[in-house]
């Protein structure tokens, strides 16, 4: 009965794969797939290159990268040849007005006068009360504080120069970075004139300076890296070895390890149930009920009512029950999963080069990101700079008649305005001309290009690895039948025949991701809107798109495996992969979860191991090491520890992603093998003896004088 039902289910997801006597693993005789998409992708890349060239021709990233004074003149060039650094009169106004978009579009522009200086101020200084009536010459020029805007007369009153923002009212010890003077040391600021009654700003400035400590910290960080880089590399080497070791040792310990992990999860859930029960009992005896609490948005309040703990107890109990039932009734599936993991470990051992393929992917991703970043930067600076009239305080007497934000010439500053602090400042880039008018569209094109190329590179990696691992599975006599250079041949084969299919899959994913980005942007814009219906709809949309992206990633991954094996187009491969998986849905879920659990534990082991070792080493807790192994003296010992941990995570993720791909590929091959073959002499199974044993199947032994037909 159950068998008949299963057959019906299988029928719904297509017929099992028929035996094909010519099939010997990844097909050799292939033709190009998804040619239209390939052409489209190549045209798009060509367009992307054209956009890059146009951006390069029209753009001037100096406008963003190099500092410019209030008049728009570059520091360190022309008239400011000897003044390479930019000083902001009030850098805190930059902090208050800067965001990532304005920086991307306009560079580091701030609503405060900016002047090119030969060197950054070294000492903290504020205009003293008694200096307001002095001359600019006495206060600034003779004291080597040449930080006023050009052309301020020597005998001008300081108070009027400050009112017009021609000179800075305070200076902070600064260090040049990106050609700009940034404050660094923890200065105790003297009373800041004019803003002393504005406590918030005064405290904010002092707090910022105290907390920044930027130069001291950056110097110390640099010193720490200089002293510990060698040991960080050692830690990363350890992470690399641990990851490899973990993957290679899986063939020996996969069974016991999975069992221990599952029992561990059961144990954690059991403890959770016990804890929830205890909390529930205590609160029940106290009579603490949700009815007494009423409705509240304070989530922590729910911890003190019995219903919360009862609900948690029920959820955990259900999970525990499900896991126990899975363990009892799906023993066979778990054993298959373990055997596949062992097989994957063997495959990686046979083809160690695959473990380092993520480096290729990383480099390609880096190229894509760098190209996009440069193009975006050049595009953002492709217009003529535009300048507008601006005053720091438009409510000052004399400013009411001034048309703020009207265009002006920066070389002809409004030095004689009745409006204090009126300046001609850089606003952005003009949108005159075809390129400038199309700027937004070109930037959108660039973003699309970024997503598509990134997804294509990731797809390429998956397909190449799938091709390599499939050639391992479909080698009847291992390792003799494995191709000599499985990874390189898979790489060439994929690039030559399946660029279009990968581009198709990547495009579908890109469109979903772009939709998600747009949705995130809309959500960000609607943050202030308190309409619960709108927020609920937005949340649903975001959730749906997140699920859709997850599903497409899963589908693409398996489609690429099918493409690697059979060389069919994307749609056919995706359909075949999907139907094959749906016919074996229980196996899929079990394998997926077991692999996830194992790889999570692997990452934990690698990162935790490196973290613990780094902690004990860098904090000097390991005694009795030889002179060569003495831990360096550090300002912040947590710095190399955190670097080692992050590096270890990246390395482990890279290795385990390869392993994950290997498991998925072998799993699909295994399912194909089960449907395609029957263990007879003509149709022997390609799977390992351990898998055959678990399934209770075996290959017919050929007579001694006969060799298996090839």
């Amino acid at each position: 009965m159950g068998g008949k039902q299963r057959d019906k289910d299988d029928e719904a997801y297509g017929k099992p794969v028929k035996y094909d006597p010519s099939f010997r693993g990844p097909i050799k005789n292939r033709s190009c797939t998804d040619v239209i998409c390939c052409v489209l992708f190549l045209l798009f890349i060509l367009g992307y290159i054209v956009v890059g060239i146009v951006a390069w021709l029209y753009g001037d990233p100096r406008q963003v990268l190099y500092p410019r004074n209030s008049t728009g003149a570059y520091c360190g060039m022309g008239e400011n040849k000897d003044k390479p650094y930019l000083l902001y009169f009030n850098i805190f106004s930059c902090i208050l007005s800067t965001n990532i978009i304005s920086v991307a579009e306009n560079g580091l522009q701030c609503p405060t006068p900016q002047v090119c200086v030969s060197s950054c101020p070294e000492d903290p200084w504020t205009v003293g009360k008694n200096q307001f009536s002095q001359t600019v010459g006495e206060v600034f020029y003779t004291k080597n504080r040449n930080f006023c805007l050009p052309g301020v007369p020597w005998n001008m009153m300081v108070i009027t120069s400050l009112q017009q923002e021609l000179c800075p009212s305070f200076l902070l010890p600064s260090a040049p970075a990106l050609g700009r003077c940034f404050p660094w040391t923890n200065v105790t600021l003297p009373e800041l004139p004019g803003i002393t009654n504005d406590t918030t700003i005064a405290q904010g400035i002092s707090g910022l300076i105290d907390s920044l400590n930027a130069r001291d910290i950056s110097v110390k960080i640099f010193e720490d890296f200089a002293h510990s880089w060698y040991w960080i590399l050692v830690a990363l080497g350890v992470a690399l070895l641990l990851s490899l070791l973990f993957i290679l040792l899986l063939r020996l310990v996969a069974g016991p390890l999975v069992l221990v992990l599952i029992l561990g999860v059961l144990g954690v859930l059991a403890y959770g149930i016990y804890y929830c029960w205890e909390e529930y009992r205590v609160l029940r005896d106290k009579g603490a009920s949700i009815s007494q609490l009423g409705f509240t948005t304070n989530l922590s309040a729910y911890q003190s009512v019995q219903e919360t703990w009862l609900a948690a107890l029920i959820v955990l109990a259900v999970l525990e029950a499900i896991l126990l039932l899975v363990l009892i009734f799906l023993r066979q599936r778990i054993r298959i999963a373990i055997a596949l993991l062992k097989e994957a470990s063997k495959a990686v051992g046979q083809m160690m080069s695959t473990m380092f393929y993520p480096l290729v992917t990383f480099v390609l991703l880096l190229i894509c990101i760098a190209y996009w970043a440069m193009t975006a930067l050049y595009l953002a600076t492709s217009g003529q700079p535009q300048y507008v009239l601006w005053a720091s305080n438009i409510s000052s007497p004399g400013c009411e008649k001034v048309s703020i934000n009207t265009s002006c010439n920066p070389m002809d500053q409004p030095v004689n305005s009745s409006c204090p602090g009126l300046m001609c400042v850089f606003q952005g880039y003009s949108s005159k001309g075809l390129v400038q008018r199309s700027l937004f569209n070109l930037q959108i094109y660039g973003v699309l290009g970024l997503f598509w190329t990134l997804n294509w590179v990731l797809a390429l990696g998956q397909c190449v690895l799938a091709g390599a691992f499939a050639s391992f599975y479909w080698a009847f006599h291992k390792p003799q039948d494995i191709p000599t250079f499985p990874l390189i041949s898979a790489f060439i084969r994929t690039l030559r025949y399946h660029t279009g299919s990968l581009a198709f899959g990547a495009l579908i994913l890109t469109l979903v991701q772009i939709a998600r980005v747009i949705l995130e942007y809309i959500d960000h814009k609607l943050r202030g809107v308190q309409n619960p219906v709108a927020r609920c709809i937005m949340c649903c949309f975001k959730c749906c798109l997140w699920c859709l992206e997850k599903f497409i990633k899963f589908l693409n991954r398996n489609a690429y495996i099918m493409i690697a094996i059979y060389g069919k187009n994307f749609c056919v491969s995706a359909k075949n992969a999907f139907t094959l998986l749906m016919r074996n849905i229980v196996r899929v879920v079990v394998l997926d979860k077991v692999t996830d659990l194992l790889l999570f534990f692997g990452k934990l082991l690698v990162v935790g191991g490196v973290g613990v070792l780094s902690f004990f080493f860098f904090s000097g807790r390991i005694q009795g090491l030889g002179r060569d192994f003495k831990s360096p003296h550090l300002n912040y010992y947590w710095l190399p520890i955190m670097t080692s941990i992050m590096g270890a995570y990246v390395i482990a993720s890279g290795f385990f992603s390869v392993f994950g791909m290997c498991v998925d590929t072998l799993f699909l091959c295994f399912l194909e093998d089960l449907e395609r073959n029957d263990g007879s002499l003509d149709r022997p199974y390609y799977m390992s003896k351990s898998l055959l044993k678990i399934l209770g199947k075996k290959n017919e032994a050929p007579p001694d004088n006969k060799k298996r037909k090839k």
Partner: antibody, heavy 125, light 107 residues
Framework: QVQLVESGGGVVQPGRSLRLSCAAS????????MHWVRQAPGKGLEWVAV????????YYVDSVKGRFTISRDNSKNTLYLQMNSLRAEDTAVYYC??????????????????WGQGTTVTVSS | DIQMTQSPSSLSASVGDRVTITCRAS??????LAWFQQKPGKAPKSLIY???SLQSGVPSKFSGSGSGTVFTLTISSLQPEDFATYYC?????????FGPGTKVDFK
């Protein structure tokens, strides 16, 4: 109300000295800058010197630099102008004037507001 | 030093006339300009400061405008008590300097 009264003017021979005084009342003298302005007979106004509230910062017109000294005694609410090496061209009515800037304001400077009635200095042989 | 010039140096007007006096600075002085009124034998009196702000107690018929190098004092409707000499003064760069004055007398 705010009042400034000048004294000490008179007829003096060239090369001699004279000391003018300006008595202030009706405001906190020690908080304000004070100016001397002169007006030659039939001519326009000429700014001579300024002394700021704490007496530390003093500025003069070039024609009197090194000969005239502006000073103040905040305890007596009095402003002084010590004139040495007097010349015929120093003949004028000398006014003292209060500056609007009181040192407690920060970014606003608006110049002089209240003037005294003036004292006449005649330099003649 | 900043030179201040006034035009006209004198003008004759009748009661009720609208009178405009112009003051020019040899270099930009922003809005640091004051206007004073002086009657014969009397001390000068402050009318306008910061180029356009009216001194308290001064009637609103007096108004000032301009910035940078060109400034104007306007008396919207001349009254008998307004016949006097008017001086402009810059007070941003030492030494502070006055204009030569504009004498307003009866036509």
């Amino acid at each position: 109300q705010v009042q400034l009264v000048e004294s000490g003017g008179g007829v003096v021979q060239p090369g001699r000295s004279l000391r003018l005084s300006c008595a202030a009342s009706g405001f906190t003298f020690s908080s304000y800058g004070m100016h001397w302005v002169r007006q030659a007979p039939g001519k326009g106004l000429e700014w001579v010197a300024v002394i700021w509230y704490d007496g530390r910062n003093k500025y003069y017109v070039d024609s009197v630099k090194g000969r005239f000294t502006i000073s103040r005694d905040n305890s007596k609410n009095t402003l002084y102008l010590q004139m040495n090496s007097l010349r015929a061209e120093d003949t004028a009515v000398y006014y003292c004037a209060r500056d609007r800037y009181s040192g407690s304001d920060y970014y606003y400077y608006y110049g002089m507001d209240v003037w005294g009635q003036g004292t006449t200095v005649t330099v003649s042989s | 030093d900043i030179q201040m010039t006034q035009s006209p140096s004198s003008l004759s007007a009748s009661v009720g006339d609208r009178v405009t006096i112009t003051c020019r600075a040899s270099q930009g002085i922003y809005n640091y300009l004051a206007w004073f009124q002086q009657k014969p034998g009397k001390a000068p009196k402050s009318l306008i400061y910061a180029a356009s702000s009216l001194q308290s107690g001064v009637p609103s018929k007096f108004s000032g405008s301009g910035s940078g190098t060109v400034f104007t004092l306007t008396i919207s409707s001349l009254q008998p008590e307004d016949f006097a000499t008017y001086y402009c003064q810059q007070y941003t760069v030492y030494p502070f300097t006055f204009g030569p004055g504009t004498k307003v007398d009866f036509k």
